[in-house]
């Protein structure tokens, strides 16, 4: 029967008695940084090349036995569920290992990027079609090597990686941590986070999804015809290496960028136990798990967006967090979160010719994370429009005012230590189509965009007193692209997206009482482009 | 292709005529940095990647490579070029003392320093 | 292009052994073993077993076992499989062929074995 | 006696399809997706015409094709042409190595 971990991934659309997706990523070649690898074993002879790349360093100790089985291990059971014959992801997808991990396992940064410019200048000398780099391995944080996957992943090519199994934040491992790289953590078969020995998978903001990573059937290097079953989250980069190959081969014109979002579009979502976590990660650790498209043509029309949390900005007075989109990617809103709710909003400022998200702390708070929504619209113009506090009036307004520009998403940012000791109205202005509402004190940032075909609405979820959570979220077929909370007291903690629904978090004031005046609203911005919509029904 | 030997005569004079043998400073006035990894266990020390400015061409590279191998020389240090890098990253893989790293960071072209550290499989 | 070339055909008696060379060329060598599969005259495919070109790692049919010696030249780049103890019952061309898989087939060796 | 079962032979006039069997058990044909299938003309070595159940190596008509239902492959050629009477294996992995069924010979009317 189908292995768990392939049933997983796979849509209920293509689950028979065996895992045969249509399209094996046959036009993707994938590159495995690794060990050695057993390359006639049964499962995946003739899928991989073997380069003559090679740079580890000695094994330790002087009584170690290099043993042929063992040092091939790793790289072998890698290369099989990425396209291995039975137990494999990609199963058309041809692989070119190079050996950066010697037979303990352990590589260098600097082997592993010399081998990063080996690919690259492979693919200069003989362009091909997409690439897929998988770099199941983790260091401690290093700049170079995330610089080195910074500059492979703008060439084209698409890298994945590990994020880890030191149940810790991937954010302090490279290339985890590289914001280009797909990183990727493990789960079980029953979705729960990954535990290996006393450690296990990594977390946090530098996590893009997770992918199946425990118990892992495999190619052994033990026999040519062996299998085993392996846990780590190196497994579950290797499960999205796969699916990126076959995503890549029904579309190798995708972007890095247009691929991620589609990983994220179509994994599984929320059926991750958030527990497992620390409870400062959970926030900030994507609730997703990886799977196949429910078909490989027809997600064009879709108008896709993430979140992306910044680093936390430190508890300083004047300490900002930025949160940035990636280079193909539109900022189309942004907001903030702080667990103390000391915090100064947040605005969208242009920053090297592209927009960013900042966050500013206020004083006596423990620090703020910066939250961009970035979405893929393509042909987009978009600025930001901003309105000083109105002090005196019933609060500050500000709207879209150009021809054909729709409201995207909506910030404030004061500089007022604590908007609680300056009450808003009671009766406060409702939000209107294009325009953002906000405390009297704060200058509000409206984002406004011109984009063919692109029309947003705004919807609103308001409770009478604060009570930890209030949510919308966009219906099918609309995307949230701005979360933001109404009017912004001190109750309130932040806003963020999480999919498709709008989270505002306030103090729980339930047991102290509370007025009419700390209600709360969430409110959505959802959008929907009409114009992919008729492009992907003009390709069918 | 430029005669890298004469580069590299021109380069022990210019070294020569420096009253103490130190490199000039980086050009804009910026301090290159250093960096190691966090995790004590993992660092590789005596093994440093020297990553150079972005528009640094090859011949740059090899040129600042060898011109550190020169000033180390003077000091009476070793040091072994293991890797001139191009195509992702202008720098090189440098096998020296770490005694020598205040003189590479005062290197022209450079951007930053980071010591070798372990990468592990996963 | 990719080929299998075998040694020519052998006569031997009960008893004796056979040595049988395939000679591989236009392809990765380490990403395929060699499969080893014989063919008694007027009867079907006998899959006899297999050798890595990678590590020289071997994996017999239980049939042939103790038997059999498959081996392999890197330097040259050709397996060789050896059958001892010959019996009449091994008459048959003997075909080396790429992999597992098989996709490319040598071009037979026969083997008679007749007192 | 081989772990394939294929019928002993088939016939079709040219132009017509034919459908090859080939059974096995959960432990080859059933339990994997690497049925191979090949032709072998009288004198000459098998030839590869169908691997991984149903794919094509390059050069092989698009008149071969294959396909697998529970512990059952087939091998259906449609429009039939002279040139492709000849003898029909079926191969699958096992746990541990590989097995052929007992072959199928096909006469084109």
């Known amino acids: 029967s189908i292995p768990w971990n392939l049933e997983r991934i796979t849509p209920p659309r293509y689950r028979a008695d065996e895992y045969q997706p249509p399209d094996g990523g046959s036009l993707v070649e994938v590159y495995l940084l690794d060990t050695s690898i057993q390359s006639d074993h049964r499962e995946i002879e003739g899928r991989v090349m073997v380069t003559d790349f090679e740079n580890v360093p000695e094994e330790d100790g002087t009584r170690f036995h290099r043993q042929a089985s063992k040092c091939d291990s790793h790289g072998t059971h890698l290369a099989g569920v990425v396209s291995g014959r039975d137990a494999g992801v990609a199963k058309g997808a041809s692989m070119r290992s190079l050996r950066v991990l010697n037979c303990q396992g352990k590589g260098t940064v600097s082997g592993t990027l010399i081998g990063l410019e080996f690919i690259r200048k492979s693919q200069l000398v003989q362009p091909v079609g997409p690439l897929v780099v998988l770099l199941p391995l983790a260091g401690g944080y290093s700049r170079v090597l995330n610089a080195a996957c910074q500059r492979l992943a703008r060439a084209g090519v698409v890298l994945v990686t590990a994020a880890g199994n030191f149940r810790d934040d991937a954010c302090l491992y490279s290339p985890a941590s590289a914001p280009e790289v797909i990183t990727v953590g493990a789960t079980n078969a029953q979705d729960q986070p990954v535990t290996l020995g006393t450690l296990g998978t990594n977390f946090g903001r530098c996590v893009d999804l997770f992918a199946p990573g425990e118990d892992i059937i495999g190619a052994s290097s033990d026999c040519s015809t062996c299998f085993v079953s392996q846990s780590g989250t190196s497994q579950a980069a290797a499960h999205v290496a796969g699916i990126a190959a076959m995503m890549l081969s029904a579309e190798p014109e995708l972007t890095l960028a247009e691929l991620r979002q589609r990983l994220i579009h179509f994994s599984a979502k929320d059926v991750i136990n958030e527990a497992w976590f620390p409870e400062d990660q959970r926030v900030l650790t994507p609730n997703l798990v990886a799977a196949l498209p429910p078909s490989t043509h027809g997600a064009g029309w879709q108008l896709f967006c993430r979140t992306v949390w910044s680093a936390h900005s430190g508890p300083t007075r004047m300490a900002t967090a930025i949160a940035r989109c990636a280079p193909d990617e539109e900022l189309l809103s942004c907001s903030s979160f702080s667990r103390s709710g000391k915090r100064r909003g947040e605005r969208m400022e242009a920053q090297g010719g592209k927009l960013v998200c900042r966050a500013h702390n206020a004083f006596g708070g423990e620090g703020v994370y910066a939250i961009a929504r970035c979405c893929l619209l393509p042909q987009a113009n978009c600025s930001v429009h901003t309105a000083p506090p109105a002090e005196a009036s019933m609060g500050t307004r500000v709207h879209c005012h150009q021809q054909g520009h729709v409201l995207t998403g909506c910030s404030s940012h004061w500089e007022v230590e604590d908007l609680g000791t300056h009450k808003p109205p009671v009766l406060r202005p409702r939000g209107q189509p294009n325009q953002c509402v906000g405390h009297r004190e704060a200058s509000i940032h409206a984002s406004c965009c011109h984009a063919p075909g692109l029309e947003c609405k705004v919807k609103e979820h308001g409770i009478p007193a604060p009570q930890g959570q209030v949510t919308v979220a966009c219906e099918e077929g609309w995307t949230l692209t701005g979360c933001s909370a109404l009017p912004g007291t001190s109750h309130v903690l932040g806003a963020y997206a999480v999919d498709n629904t709008c989270v505002v978090r306030s103090r729980d004031v339930s047991t102290t009482g509370s007025t009419s005046e700390e209600a709360v609203t969430a409110v959505a911005i959802c959008c929907r482009s009409r114009h992919l919509a008729q492009a992907s029904q003009e390709l069918q | 292709q430029e005669d890298e030997d004469g580069d590299y005569e021109e380069l022990v004079l210019a070294l020569r005529s420096e009253e103490d043998g130190l490199a000039e400073a980086p050009e804009h006035g910026t301090t290159a940095t250093f960096h190691r990894c966090a995790k004590d266990p993992w660092r590789l020390p005596g093994t440093y990647v020297v990553v150079l400015k972005e528009e640094t061409h090859l011949s740059q590279s090899e040129r600042t490579a060898r011109r550190l191998q020169a000033q180390a020389a003077r000091r009476g240090y070793l040091t072994k070029i293991l890797h001139v890098f191009h195509g992702l990253l202008p720098g090189f893989l440098v096998k020296m003392s770490g005694d020598l790293l205040e003189l590479a960071l005062k290197l022209p072209h450079v951007d930053y320093i980071e010591e070798d550290s372990s990468v592990f499989a996963q | 292009q990719v080929q299998l070339v075998q040694s020519g055909a052998e006569v031997k008696k009960p008893g004796a052994s056979v040595k049988v060379s395939c000679k591989a060329s236009g392809y990765a060598l380490t990403s395929y073993g060699i499969s080893w599969v014989r063919q008694a005259p007027g009867q079907g495919l006998e899959w006899m077993g297999w050798i890595s070109a990678y590590n020289g790692n071997t994996n017999y049919a239980q049939k042939v076992q103790g038997r059999v010696t498959m081996t392999t030249d890197t330097s040259t780049s050709t397996v060789y499989m050896e059958l001892r103890s010959l019996r009449s019952d091994d008459t048959a061309v003997y075909y080396c062929?790429?992999?597992?898989?098989?996709?490319?087939w040598g071009q037979g060796t026969t083997v008679t074995v007749s007192s | 006696q081989s772990a394939l079962t294929q019928p002993a032979s088939v016939s079709g006039s040219p132009g017509q399809s034919i459908t090859i069997s080939c059974t096995g058990t959960n432990s080859d044909v059933g339990g994997y997706n690497s049925v191979s299938w090949y032709q072998q003309h009288p004198g000459k070595p098998p030839k590869l015409m169908i691997y991984e159940v149903s794919n094509r190596p390059s050069g092989i008509s698009n008149r071969f094709s294959g396909s697998k239902s529970g512990n059952t492959a087939s091998l259906t050629i449609s429009g039939l042409q002279a040139e492709d009477e000849a003898d029909y294996f079926c191969?699958?992995?096992?746990?541990?190595?590989?097995?052929f069924g007992g072959g199928t010979k096909l006469t084109v009317l």
């Open positions: 062929a790429r992999g597992y898989g098989m996709d490319v």
């Open positions: 191969s699958s992995y096992t746990s541990t190595s590989m097995v």
